[in-house]
């Protein structure tokens, strides 16, 4: 007996050939021999099967004696034994038919755990491998399940069923929701503006949720809530703001924080979280905030970062052309009696400069510019 | 989306054969039938034949039985449509097309067309 | 086979007017009727199945009717990009295609 794999909602077709290539009389049954459609005449019959509203034939075939059985919105329990009278003979197919679906909803935040369900008819015994969009895979009976989501795992699952020598594709798309990045790191120097910028990984046609902004200052003892905020529908509304400092936030996603001036006391680490409506769990990024002042006070030139740098960071302060006259893995680096010129006070990671201050020194007896 | 993606022109002899890929996307290839319809130059269309891409069965327009053959691909989601014995009046552009879900033997998506040239 | 004849063959219109196509089967169909928009050099589009409903995507000036041997497709108001071969097709027996009704600038 031949053996058709379906999916459920799906459509498929089985396929009932007579030797005369001309339209005879032909009939399809259950396995109760309960008639779903057949044909008299030129004309397409129904019989009293469950299948009534959703089987159908395909007429145009029927001159060249094939006489399909078309079952639209395929249903587990569609899954059957169907047989094809014609010409005194009977062809016999089974049909199964597999849903997969996954736990909850298609749209998990990252950390959280993708279950996969598999629907098989009753006496089945399918396997299951699942390739994730990153090219992983998952192997599994009924239930296949992946923890800790990752951002990689957002795309197309392509899931491949085996029964029987045969197979059936399942494709479901993920959403992983999740921030572009987990943490981000702004360098600026003393009393410029600040520009915080944290970019979804995903894309949703309505979204809707609400967030915060706590930071931990380095020179504070413990963290504060900087802002509140609301999202409906991509827009966002400022809820709450602390007067010091007054951040201002964008109207429109991505979510967007404008901090008016890099000051010492700002400098340390936020952790932005947005709940998403319907959602268990919150989204997170971290950011970090560096400030750089570079200063003159007398016969002392100095040079200091505040905020949360790493150990292979290196301060530098030299005259402009001219190599480093000291080089720190330090957060404060000093000249004692400059030379007059044009200094800079460089961060750097590896050669590569993070932050640069730049900070004139005249001769002796005029006063520092900043420029 | 769904799109049916045809292979390129082909110019061959009387007598030659000529195979035409279709490659679909953007949906379950093995639930809809993909039919072949061709167009000679400035002319109607013309049905040739069916596959069922789930089984592998075949049909054509008695016209072109013995000289059309169709087999699948599923592993790459690709139909082929083979006609042997060529002559002239078989050049035209010939297209795939998939039956919609809503009805058979309705052509819902259409390949872009492959121009078939037969010159001696 | 069933042979489907489309009339006028070709016909003229302006931007704006109604126009009607015909198509008629050699023996009747009930409504396993389909019709088609095809532009030169493109792949022809389904506009109406089933003598009478319309394709999704499809404008709603278009509209389709008719059962058994007469079928209609009508276009309330031409717009520019209307301006095609149109084309019935049967699938009540093994497929075929009317001849097509060309479609042009008045």
């Known amino acids: 007996k031949k053996v058709v794999l379906g999916k459920k909602g799906d459509t498929v077709e089985l396929t009932c050939t007579a030797s005369q290539k001309k339209s005879i009389q032909f009939h399809w049954k259950n396995s109760n021999q309960i008639k779903i459609l057949g044909n008299q005449g030129s004309f397409l019959t129904k019989g009293p099967s469950k299948l009534n509203d959703r089987a159908d034939s395909r007429r145009s075939l029927w001159d060249q004696g094939n006489f399909p059985l078309i079952i639209k919105n395929l249903k587990i329990e569609d899954s059957d034994t169907y047989i094809c009278e014609v010409e005194d003979q009977k062809e016999e197919v089974q049909l199964l038919v597999f849903g997969l679906t996954a736990n909850s909803d298609t749209h998990l935040l990252q950390g959280q755990s993708l279950t996969l369900t598999l629907e098989s008819p009753p006496g089945s015994s399918p396997s299951v491998q699942c390739r994730s969009p990153r090219g992983k895979n998952i192997q599994g009976g009924k239930t296949l399940s992946v923890s800790q989501l990752e951002l990689q795992d957002s795309g197309t699952w392509t899931c491949t069923v085996l029964q029987n020598q045969k197979k059936v594709e399942f494709k479901i798309d993920i959403v992983v929701l999740a921030f572009q990045k987990a943490s981000s790191i702004v360098y600026k120097k003393e009393g410029e503006q600040v520009e915080f910028s944290f970019p979804l990984a995903f894309t949703v046609e309505k979204l809707t949720g609400s967030g915060e902004l706590w930071w931990q200052a380095e020179r504070a003892s413990s963290s504060k809530s900087w802002i509140t905020f609301d999202l409906k529908n991509k827009e966002v509304s400022v809820k709450r703001v602390t007067q010091d400092p007054k951040l201002q936030m964008g109207k429109k996603l991505p979510l967007h924080l404008t901090l008016p001036q890099a000051l010492p006391q700002y400098a340390g680490s936020g952790n932005l979280t947005l709940a998403l409506e319907a959602k268990t769990g919150k989204l997170h990024q971290e950011v970090n905030l560096v400030v750089m002042r570079a200063t003159q006070l007398q016969k002392n030139l100095t040079c200091e970062v505040w905020g949360p740098t790493s150990p292979k960071l290196m301060l530098s302060l030299k005259l402009e052309n001219k190599e480093a006259k000291v080089s720190k893995r330090e957060k404060a680096v000093w000249v004692l009696n400059p030379e007059a010129g044009m200094w800079q006070c460089l961060l750097s990671d590896s050669g590569q400069v993070l932050l640069e201050s730049n900070i004139k020194v005249l001769p002796t007896w005029s006063t520092p510019v900043q420029p | 989306q769904v799109q049916l993606v045809q292979s390129g022109a082909e110019v061959k002899k009387p007598g030659a054969s000529v195979k035409v890929s279709c490659k679909a996307s953007g949906y379950t290839f093995t639930t809809y039938y993909i039919h072949w319809v061709r167009q000679a130059p400035g002319q109607g269309l013309e049905w040739m034949g069916w596959m069922n891409p789930n089984t592998g069965d075949t049909g054509s327009a008695q016209k072109f039985q013995g000289r059309v053959t169709m087999t699948r691909d599923t592993s790459t989601s690709t139909v082929y449509m083979e006609l042997s014995s060529l002559r002239s009046e078989d050049t035209a552009v010939y297209y795939c097309?998939?039956?919609?879900?809503?009805?058979?033997?309705?052509?819902?998506?259409w390949g872009q067309g492959t121009m078939v040239t037969v010159s001696s | 086979d069933i042979q489907m004849t489309q009339s006028p063959s070709s016909l003229s219109a302006s931007v704006g007017d109604r126009v009607t196509i015909t198509c008629r089967a050699s023996q009747s169909i009930s409504t396993y009727l389909n019709w088609y928009q095809q532009k030169p050099g493109k792949a022809p589009k389904l506009l109406i199945y089933a003598a009478s409903t319309l394709q999704s995507g499809v404008p709603s000036r278009f509209s389709g009717s008719g059962s058994g041997t007469d079928f209609t497709l009508t276009i309330s108001s031409l717009q520019p990009e209307d301006f095609a071969t149109y084309y019935c097709?049967?699938?009540?027996?093994?497929?075929?295609f009317g001849q097509g009704t060309r479609l042009e600038i008045k």
């Open positions: 097709q049967q699938s009540y027996r093994t497929v075929t």
């Open positions: 097309a998939k039956d919609p879900a809503v009805t058979p033997d309705a052509f819902d998506i």
